[in-house]
Amino acid sequence: MSKGEELFTGVVPILVELDGDVNGHKFSVSGEGEGDATYGKLTLKFICTTGKLPVPWPTLVTTFSYGVQCFSRYPDHMKQHDFFKSAMPEGYVQERTIFFKDDGNYKTRAEVKFEGDTLVNRIELKGIDFKEDGNILGHKLEYNYNSHNVYIMADKQKNGIKVNFKIRHNIEDGSVQLADHYQQNTPIGDGPVLLPDNHYLSTQSALSKDPNEKRDHMVLLEFVTAAGITHGMDELYK
């Protein structure tokens, strides 16, 4: 067990802070919830603290919760490939470019680290080149989320990882909006981190609303499990 992994043996409180600017539309989002890495489970509620969110909530899911991949469940035989927990408590910087097909792009930079006993994800997001009447600024996405695989590989030069995946957002007319994600994670501290073999995270997310909440918001339940590396031969013959 890495030193960082010991911080995730129980339920951990999570705070998320996002400041965004998409085509000049500025907004802030505040998130609170809990993570339980034993089950790869996240429960979070996000509130737009500046009024109405100028983009659809589903376009921010990867920035919020795929941001705290340290809560992913890594099976016992894969624990030596868990970069995310090994970087804690000092944390990691997570940078992404997200290309929305036939539309604009988001660039995000986040610092994910422990502050006291709380895991904090602080994010800056800049979006450019979006069509005002497109699927994103035109709010044409359905309020739901598909399952995805998130592919991880080591980046030895930067002592971190590179991550690629493609999100499929459902559009109200029955078609799909693709969002290509290019991600890089580097540790904040200078302690040792685990550099993984290639593998993937399998994610399942459910979006809902709080019937008592008047503010623009999103409630998220998510399960994430690492996969893609088989047991060694010695395991098979036990």
Partner: nanobody
Framework: QVQLVESGGGLVQAGAALRLSCAAS????????MGWFRQAPGKEREFVVS????????AYADSVKGRFTISRDNAKNTAYLQMNSLKPEDTAVYYC???????????????WGQGTQVTVS
Amino acid sequence: QVQLVESGGGLVQAGAALRLSCAASGGTFSFYNMGWFRQAPGKEREFVVSISRSGGGTAYADSVKGRFTISRDNAKNTAYLQMNSLKPEDTAVYYCAAGLRDWGREGEPHYWGQGTQVTVS
């Protein structure tokens, strides 16, 4: 996600006492700062009192200091508001609130209950 349900409201005469309860579910209660807000007819919702995660720190609005007491029982996932020497101006809907952040007197908690009516005649 955290859900809050208030109880204990009602109609009382001036000078009487009431105890409100706020039962929390769906989260780890001991993680959250808890508090009470109130909204009188035709007025904005206002801060009444808050209590820290451990129960060690409290903050009160000047209008209720010395009369209201907040407490919590982390084993029962419940927060309480003991209201003594009630006045007609305490009449309002009382809302329980919770949040990981320390929202203080000015901030906005993340989670709210539906409220319970307190009427002082």
